[in-house]
Interface confidence: low
């Protein structure tokens, strides 16, 4: 229905609390250099222009879009030219085209210091005196360096945040409490983030219709029980919400995704069973948990497939009639049977089916053609099952530093013109799989493995579209989102790579690294060894073991030594000595 | 479960109209593949027009296309067949079958049907 005044209808619908979190988060994801306080001046400007609309809907301006009403904010602030360059060449156009301008600016890969948690005492002061502030802060430094954040997912995260202070902050040892759940919300929070980007590409670059492929396969697998005109109704409007918010329409998105909830918590009983505990949380929870919903129980008496898709006669018929639809119940009936199964896997083989229709209904005697259809899935579906089994075995061996190794050395080796920083960020990014993946029962592993590899994979296409190098790269990234991770699978090592010169000072290191944290000592030596590939991108494990642990022990020993700056600067140069021998 | 209750046959004469009728309960007809069927005395169970569910998509035997249509009206759950220029060949007892939790698509095979009604008689004869 339509509203006089959109921004009032909605402050009215998500209340204030988070209209203001979506307006900060809005602000944040479009100009990420500004800092905290200039942002909090605008949401401040924004709401009480909300409140004036709210009390009389005919108040100047109020029938404005909110594209046009955050726009015109943005193009207001002071020298921004002098800090976002081009950015500022977008308010010279009108809407639509200036939000897309904005769009197309964000950056995936802000020049950001990386995001320094503060000590657990100085933490809990700076929540006790202000916990709003405390909180926008929070809201702000994610949006900012993530950019396509899902944004009623990240007011979730601020309120789970919240959670873990008020808690925590009133213990003895509060950095004991904090740090294992503040760890365990980061890295959600960051899964969520590069899955959230995924789908944002997904409808950039393919748009709504694939899209809605991907969610109709996700929810036949949640709810199995649904029938197919529930899932295109949850589908759709899925759809609707993620475009909302790619697009940055995020205070939309946020009301349009509390709408979802509310119906499906209303229709449970033509969706599924296992949705009653989320359905009696507050609105942010209830979302989360209606999206992290564990699949129901399939029924017990679903006929064969190939009934409908194989054996019917009217197979061609009905594929002609209604194209999508019919692929739309292949791809919902073949996912309501295989929770078991990634999305990704699913989605190849409603294409490989579509593709054998397309064939096979030209030809003169089509369920010949298409009759073997079924059989011919079993490569597609063995190719990632044997990557989940070589891949965890590797990872129960090596544990997750060491397979996260294992990744880089391979990845350089596809792509060694990418930029280190980048291999080394997808290489603990993809390594991090076992530790996600590996313990979970066999029949969620697939669709763990495969998925979130797919995602990070998108970050990687994400980042190298900006400063492409590697054509390899290019070639995976630009084909069908589906399709990427094989292609990447199938890589090998990169022929036409011209080794890069020995540089001495790459491996030359001093006293500093000994106070690094577990974490930054670990990218160091990972920076090493992508370094070291792609100086020897043949060189074999044993050589490339020798070596780093070498390296490790020199590390190790200098940092026990009395003077650490002299162990550095004497050993070092023996080290880069024998790596070079060890390599030659 | 899925009750389904047609009316509407008759006697009617060659290049006659009538109207067949399903009433629904149990289940929103505009949310399940419905079809009408046929049975002619010795003959086998035959597929005349089907809609999906979900989705307004008709389809028709060759042997009754352009002349009968198939609707529903959701508001009063109700499954109709609109049968115009009879022919004798078109007795036989009609049937109306219902498909929900399958794919939103008619398909022709009976067999694929769980919930039918008891049939209305339609007799085309001078």
């Known amino acids: 229905e339509a509203h006089k005044s959109e921004i009032a209808h909605r402050f009215k619908d998500l209340g204030e609390q988070h209209f203001k979190g979506l307006v900060l988060i809005a602000f944040s994801q479009y100009l990420q250099k500004c800092p905290y306080e200039e942002h909090i001046k605008l949401v401040q400007e924004v709401t009480d222009f909300a409140k004036t609309c709210v009390a009389d809907e005919n108040a100047e301006n109020c029938d404005k879009s909110i594209h046009t009403l955050f726009g015109d904010k943005l193009c207001a602030i002071p020298k921004l030219r002098d800090n976002y360059g081009e950015l500022a060449d977008c308010c010279a156009k009108q809407e639509p085209e200036r939000n897309e301008c904005f769009l197309q600016h964000k950056d995936d890969n802000p020049n950001l210091p990386p995001f320094q948690r503060p000590e657990a005492e100085a933490m809990c002061t700076s929540f006790q005196e202000n916990p709003t502030s405390f909180l926008g802060h929070y809201l702000h430094e994610v949006a900012r360096r993530h950019p396509y954040f899902y944004a009623p997912e990240l007011l979730y995260y601020a309120e789970k945040y919240n959670e873990v202070l008020t808690q925590c902050c009133t213990e003895s040892d509060k950095a004991a409490c904090l740090t294992p759940k503040l760890d365990a919300v980061k890295e959600k929070a960051l899964v969520a983030a590069v899955r959230q980007r995924m789908k944002c590409s997904s409808m950039q670059r393919f748009g709504e219709r694939a899209f809605k492929a991907w969610a109709v396969a996700r929810m036949s697998q949640r709810f199995p029980n649904a029938e197919f005109a529930e899932i295109t109704k949850l589908a759709t409007d899925v759809t609707k919400i993620n475009k909302e918010c790619c697009h940055g329409d995020l205070l939309e998105c946020a009301d349009d995704r509390a709408e979802l909830a509310k119906y499906m918590c209303e229709n449970q009983a033509t969706i599924s069973s296992k949705l009653q505990a989320c359905c009696d949380k507050p609105v942010l929870q209830k979302s989360q948990c209606l999206a992290e919903i564990e699949h129901d129980n399939i029924p017990a008496d679903l006929p064969s497939i190939a009934a409908d898709f194989v054996e019917d006669k009217e197979v061609c018929k009905n594929y002609a009639e209604a194209k999508d639809v019919f692929l739309g119940t292949f791809l919902y009936e073949y996912s309501r049977r295989h929770p078991d199964y990634s999305v990704s896997l699913l989605l190849r083989l409603a294409k490989k089916y579509e593709a054998t229709l397309e064939k096979c209904c030209a030809e003169g005697d089509p369920p010949a053609c298409y009759g073997t259809v079924l059989a011919e899935f079993q490569p597609l579906v063995e190719e990632p099952k044997n990557l989940v089994k070589t891949n965890c075995e590797l990872y129960e061996k090596l544990g997750e530093y060491g397979f996260q190794n294992a990744v880089l050395v391979r990845y350089t080796q596809k792509a060694p013109q990418v930029s280190t920083p980048t291999l080394v960020e997808a290489a603990r990014n993809l390594g991090r799989v076992g530790t996600k993946c590996c313990t979970l029962p066999e029949a969620q592993r697939l669709p763990c493995v495969e998925d979130y590899l797919s995602a990070i994979l998108n970050r990687l296409c994400v980042l190298h579209e900006k400063t492409p190098v590697s054509e390899k790269v290019t070639k995976c990234c630009s084909g069908s989102l589906v399709e990427r991770r094989p292609c990447f699978s199938a890589l090998t090592v990169d022929e036409t790579y011209v080794p890069k010169e020995f540089k001495a000072e790459t491996f030359t290191f001093h006293s500093d690294i000994c106070t690094l944290p577990d974490k930054e000592k670990q990218i160091k030596k990972q920076t090493a060894l992508a370094e070291l590939v792609k100086h020897k991108p043949k060189a074999t494990e044993d050589q490339l073991k020798t070596v780093m642990g070498d390296f490790a022990q020199f590390v190790d020993k200098c940092c026990k030594a009395a003077d650490k700056d002299n162990c550095f600067a004497t050993e070092g140069p023996n080290l880069v000595a024998r790596s070079k021998e060890a390599l030659a | 479960e899925v009750q389904l209750l047609e009316s509407g046959g008759g006697l009617v004469q060659p290049g006659g109209s009538l109207r067949l009728s399903c009433a629904a309960s149990?289940?929103?007809?505009?949310?399940?593949?419905v079809a009408w069927f046929r049975q002619a005395p010795g003959k086998e169970r035959e597929f005349v027009a089907g809609?999906?569910?979900?989705?307004?998509?008709?389809y028709y035997a060759d042997s009754v296309k352009g002349r009968f249509t198939i609707s529903r009206d959701n508001s009063k759950n109700t499954l109709y067949l609109q049968m115009n220029s009879l022919r004798p060949e078109d007795t036989a007892v009609y049937y109306c079958?219902?498909?929900?939790?399958?794919?939103?698509?008619?398909?022709?095979?009976?067999?694929?049907?769980?919930?039918w009604g008891q049939g209305t008689l339609v007799t085309v004869s001078s």
């Open positions: 079958a219902a498909r929900p939790g399958r794919p939103q698509i008619t398909s022709k095979v009976a067999d694929l049907y769980p919930y």
């Open positions: 149990g289940r929103y007809i505009d949310e399940t593949a």
């Open positions: 809609i999906g569910g979900g989705v307004d998509i008709t």
